[in-house]
């Protein structure tokens, strides 16, 4: 079970006291606050494409737009990993790849992006409205997960645009260290503005939820991805879910990994050939889970809160534990 809880949400000041002029003077602090909260937040893009040649074949591509060193990638369908989603593949940068039917081939494309080809017929074949999710675990920064699916009207051979849907799940030290400094700066800025203008600053509304798993709701980096946050995760077409995950296809790990710098600080870009502007695909959503840094499929810890920057790595799953062939 994934415990979700609301964390201090940024609340605008109540209208009426200051009038329109007061609101205008608060635009700058809000912009600054938005920048403060979203600064440096990595993103995950997800792209789903149905192959024109085989209508039951899908290609999922996912990438991590961040500077951290990726420690694990989990691809699932039917929802986020650990929230009813079923694991299709787990890719470890050193130890290899495990995959489950109907995954045909999972592979590393670059040090920060992966691709997965799905095929199938019958019970284990994907269908057009299936949601696919990718979770990138980057230590110690945390885990980011994004989900996407084909637009309902997609023609075969066309792809949905990449879905940038950032989720941050980090250990407390990291998140409080970096975000704390940013938040302190923002609060200090507000304090100065308040002293200067003699007007009340926006309040931080404390959450009324379990202290076990606080969640920070931040400003989305774009209107598009903010809209995606408000799309509820509704239904899963169960006929598209796999009947069994016992079969697997062997696949080796990335042979190039050793030759690439493991600690390189870089910001990889999504492949331009697939899409020029990463905007959310229709029906995409973001989900969040509590807990400190966790690997794919590991249940959230039972102690200590985690902070996540966007509403929504081993919780309940369709199978008891991912097991595949490397």
């Amino acid at each position: 079970m994934r415990t979700e809880a609301q964390v201090p949400a940024l609340q605008p000041p109540e209208p009426g006291l200051e009038g329109a002029m007061g609101h205008r003077t608060l635009v700058l602090p809000w912009v600054l606050l938005t920048l403060c909260v979203t600064a440096g937040t990595p993103e995950v893009w997800v792209q789903v494409r149905m192959e024109a040649t085989e209508l039951s074949s899908f290609t999922i591509r996912c990438g991590f737009l961040g500077s951290g060193s990726i420690s694990l990638v989990t691809v699932s369908w039917g929802g986020p990993n650990g929230a009813g989603g079923t694991t299709l593949a787990v890719l470890h940068p050193e130890r290899g790849i495990r995959q489950w039917a109907p995954a045909r081939q999972a592979r590393w494309e670059t040090q920060s992006s992966i691709s997965l080809i799905l095929e199938g017929s019958g019970a284990s074949s994907p269908c057009a409205n299936t949601t696919f999710c990718c979770k990138f675990a980057s230590f110690p920064e945390g885990s980011w997960e994004a989900c996407g699916s084909l637009p309902p009207s997609s023609d075969p051979g066309l792809s949905a645009p990449p879905t940038p849907a950032p989720i941050l799940r980090a250990d407390l030290a990291g998140i409080l260290g970096v975000s704390g400094v940013l938040l302190f700066g923002c609060v200090y800025l507000l304090h100065l503005l308040r002293r200067h203008k003699h007007r009340p600053a926006p309040r931080l509304q404390p959450s009324r939820t379990s202290p076990q798993a606080p969640r920070a709701r931040a400003w989305a980096p774009s209107q598009a991805s903010q809209a995606a946050l408000h799309v509820p995760y509704a239904t899963i077409n169960t006929s598209c879910r796999p009947a069994t995950l016992d079969t697997a296809h062997p696949h080796g790990g990335p042979s190039w990994w050793a030759s690439l710098p493991t600690h390189a600080a870089h910001r990889p870009q999504g492949p331009a050939a697939w899409a020029s502007t990463p905007i959310p695909a229709r029906g995409s959503f973001v989900s969040v889970e509590n807990g400190l840094y966790a690997q794919a499929g590991e249940r959230p810890p039972h102690t200590g809160p985690g902070l996540t920057l966007f509403p929504d790595p081993r919780g309940p799953r369709a199978m008891e534990g991912p097991l595949g062939v490397r």
Partner: antibody, heavy 119, light 107 residues
Framework: QVQLQQSGAELVKPGASVKLSCKAS????????MYWLKQRPGQGLEWIGE????????KFNEKFKSKATLTVDKSSSTAYMQLSSLTSEDSAVYYC????????????WGQGTSVTDSS | DIQMIQSPSSMFASLGDRVSLSCRAS??????LDWYQQKPGGTIKLLIY???ILNFGVPSRFSGSGSGSDYSLTISSLESEDFADYYC?????????FGAGTKLELK
Amino acid sequence: QVQLQQSGAELVKPGASVKLSCKASGYTFTSHYMYWLKQRPGQGLEWIGEINPSNGDTKFNEKFKSKATLTVDKSSSTAYMQLSSLTSEDSAVYYCTREKDAFSALDYWGQGTSVTDSS
Amino acid sequence: DIQMIQSPSSMFASLGDRVSLSCRASQGIRGHLDWYQQKPGGTIKLLIYSTSILNFGVPSRFSGSGSGSDYSLTISSLESEDFADYYCLQRNAYPLTFGAGTKLELK
């Protein structure tokens, strides 16, 4: 509840072989890799290798490649490790343990099987 | 192979003490580090996985932290059942390797 029950202690002659067993219960046997580890008296733990019970694929520590053979019997949810050409260096306690999730931690352990050189 | 250096190799402590055990890897292991407890009878139990995640059923006095190649296990207030051997395991790369262990004894 999840349990890994290992076979009893073995007293073996140098040069002989021994087959240790680990019977799993309380979970879907084919859904979790099984690992084998070695612990010599008063020493730390060494990873011998792992097996995918779903299809029998194995991965070994180079050090144990010619020493250990890992197999499974899905019908009885049992994992086996055969040790060959035994020497006094092989006298140790051997543990089977289950991988929690893909590439994850070892969350359930057998009680261990002691293998002793009879010479 | 990745070497795991645990320190101290043994330590004496009293009930209620706060203790920290250290584990250093010969190279970065991306947080793929677990802590295990072995009781005198030989029983082995997973305490912490992926650096800081408390395994189900493990008391909250146990906590883990670290990054890169340096990791630690902390017991906030020692209880009688905590006196045992503790091992760290890196599972970032093959072969998986354990530290030599820390023996925690009652002072």
